[in-house]
């Protein structure tokens, strides 16, 4: 007997965090023998949409004109061939940018650090907030979270980074949400420029020893770094 | 600094398959829409079409019954086939990165190419 | 498919001339726009993405607008080194389509 229908691959165009207002596509990739594409979001009766296949039939095309907070969310699709539906896709999370208002992001002591030395980037919300996110520009996986322990609302969260050295260079911004739905984020803050100078270069660190660093020069996913910050947030790498 | 370098036959016969590959150095080829480009002679650019993660791709419809795009993670490098060429096919062809997410709410345009590389169809 | 025009698809200005190149899109692609500039034999290079932001390294004198289905790049004072072919691009959702380029020269 047959094993189960391989899991179409799901991603979204063009990409996963969007902007209020602008547009978005959602693709469910699955087989040549596909005769129908189902998308299911979670929390919404099922099915989400439902797609006929593109030609050649090995995907679906899910759009969505304006992004609004009813499209943030969790998604999963499936594809039906002759002999059944499939296994369910890896989910996508869609985020949505501002739905709050910005918050603030500054460095501590100042955005000129020597290599070697530590750095705090620090990012401020004028209304309570219990996630904060910072992300450094051009990344890949762009987003490293602070979250309240019990759903304090706090109105700041500390990034602490040390020891400094060249790949933490480059510019940065952060996001405040709320715990309620973490597929929601304020705007942007503005962009922080930091700037790391002096020689006092070792190896590259890697993400693995103790005290990990912020993101590699494009494409690395920022890490965390060793310390709990002072704000009482906890510390979570999604 | 992530570099891109484009590699391949520069005669291919007509009716047989073309094939490129483009080796990422300087960076991962994870998590970012990694394309092929190309140029005909005095032509202007074509988009090929796209491979993301391990295998979600897109074609321009024009080319899509003879494209296909594969990454192969372990060699950092993707690659291009497109079967039955003609002289049409005759072009520079480019690999390329669009590049990650801005926190400005924006996603970047294709950010790093390859030199290119020429193919020339012909017996 | 979404289809981009370009306009002019040539144009010849004088140094130190402010430049306009429009591109229109047959359906919006809300900011998922790009620029690129490639000089005879050589590799296109990234000026603009997000219809209006400066990619890092290309200068001032650059700068794009536009949303939905209008863009437009200008170059403020056109510089020789700026002879090129310009080329839009969407990437909105596949197929990213290339505008056809337009051919900027000096007088």
């Known amino acids: 007997q047959a094993g189960p229908l391989p899991k179409p691959t799901l991603w979204a165009e063009p990409g996963s965090v969007i902007s209020w207002g602008n547009s978005v596509t959602i693709w469910c990739q699955g087989t040549l023998e596909a005769r129908e594409y189902r998308l299911d979001k979670e929390e919404s009766p099922a099915p989400w949409d439902r797609q006929n296949p593109l030609e050649p039939k090995n995907k679906a095309r899910f759009s969505i004109p304006s992004m609004t907070e009813d499209y943030a969310g969790r998604y999963r699709c499936y594809y039906r061939s002759p002999v059944g539906w499939s296994q369910p896709s890896d989910p996508l999370e869609l985020v949505m940018t501002g739905a709050y208002s910005k918050p603030t992001l500054s460095a501590l002591p100042s955005p000129l650090v020597t290599s070697g030395k530590s750095v705090t980037l620090l990012c401020q919300s004028r209304s309570p907030m219990d996630t904060f996110l910072l992300i450094k520009e051009r990344a890949a996986h762009p987003l490293l979270h602070l979250r309240s322990e019990h759903g304090a609302q706090q109105h700041q969260a500390e990034f602490p980074m040390s020891p400094v050295t060249s790949v933490h260079g480059g510019t940065y911004r952060c996001f405040s949400s709320h715990g309620f739905s973490h597929y929601l984020l304020s705007h942007p803050s503005d962009p922080l420029e930091l700037i790391v100078s002096g020689s006092l270069e070792g190896p590259r660190p890697s993400p693995t020893r103790s005290v990990s660093t912020a993101a590699g020069p494009e494409d690395q996913p920022l890490m965390p770094t060793g310390s709990v910050p002072h704000s009482g947030l906890r510390r979570h790498w999604e | 600094q992530v570099q891109l370098q484009e590699a391949g036959p520069g005669l291919v016969n007509p009716s047989k398959t073309l094939s490129l590959t483009c080796t990422v150095s300087?960076?991962?080829?994870?998590?970012?829409?990694w394309s092929w480009i190309r140029q005909p002679p005095g032509k202007g650019l074509e988009w090929i079409g796209y491979?993301?993660?391990?295998?979600?791709?897109n074609y321009n419809p024009s080319l899509q019954s003879r494209v296909t795009i594969s990454v192969d993670m372990s060699k950092n490098h993707f690659s291009l086939k497109l079967s039955s060429v003609t002289a049409a096919d005759t072009a520079v062809y480019y690999c390329a990165r669009r590049g990650g997410y801005y926190g400005s709410g924006n996603y970047g345009g294709m950010d790093v190419w390859g030199q290119g590389t020429t193919v020339t169809v012909s017996s | 498919d979404i289809q981009m025009t370009q306009s002019p698809s040539s144009l010849s200005a004088s140094a130190g001339d402010r430049v306009t190149i429009t591109c229109r899109a047959s359906q919006g692609i809300s900011n998922y726009l790009a620029w690129y500039q490639q000089k005879p034999g050589k590799v296109p290079k990234l000026l603009m993405y997000a219809a209006s932001a400066l990619q890092s390294g290309v200068p001032s004198r650059f700068s794009g607008s536009g949303s939905g289905t209008d863009f437009t790049l200008t170059i403020s004072s056109l510089q020789p080194e700026d002879v090129a072919t310009y080329y839009c691009?969407?990437?909105?959702?596949?197929?990213?389509?290339f505008g056809q380029g337009t051919k900027v020269e000096i007088k």
């Open positions: 300087g960076g991962s080829i994870s998590s970012y829409f």
């Open positions: 691009q969407k990437y909105d959702s596949a197929p990213w389509t």
């Open positions: 491979i993301y993660n391990s295998g979600s791709t």
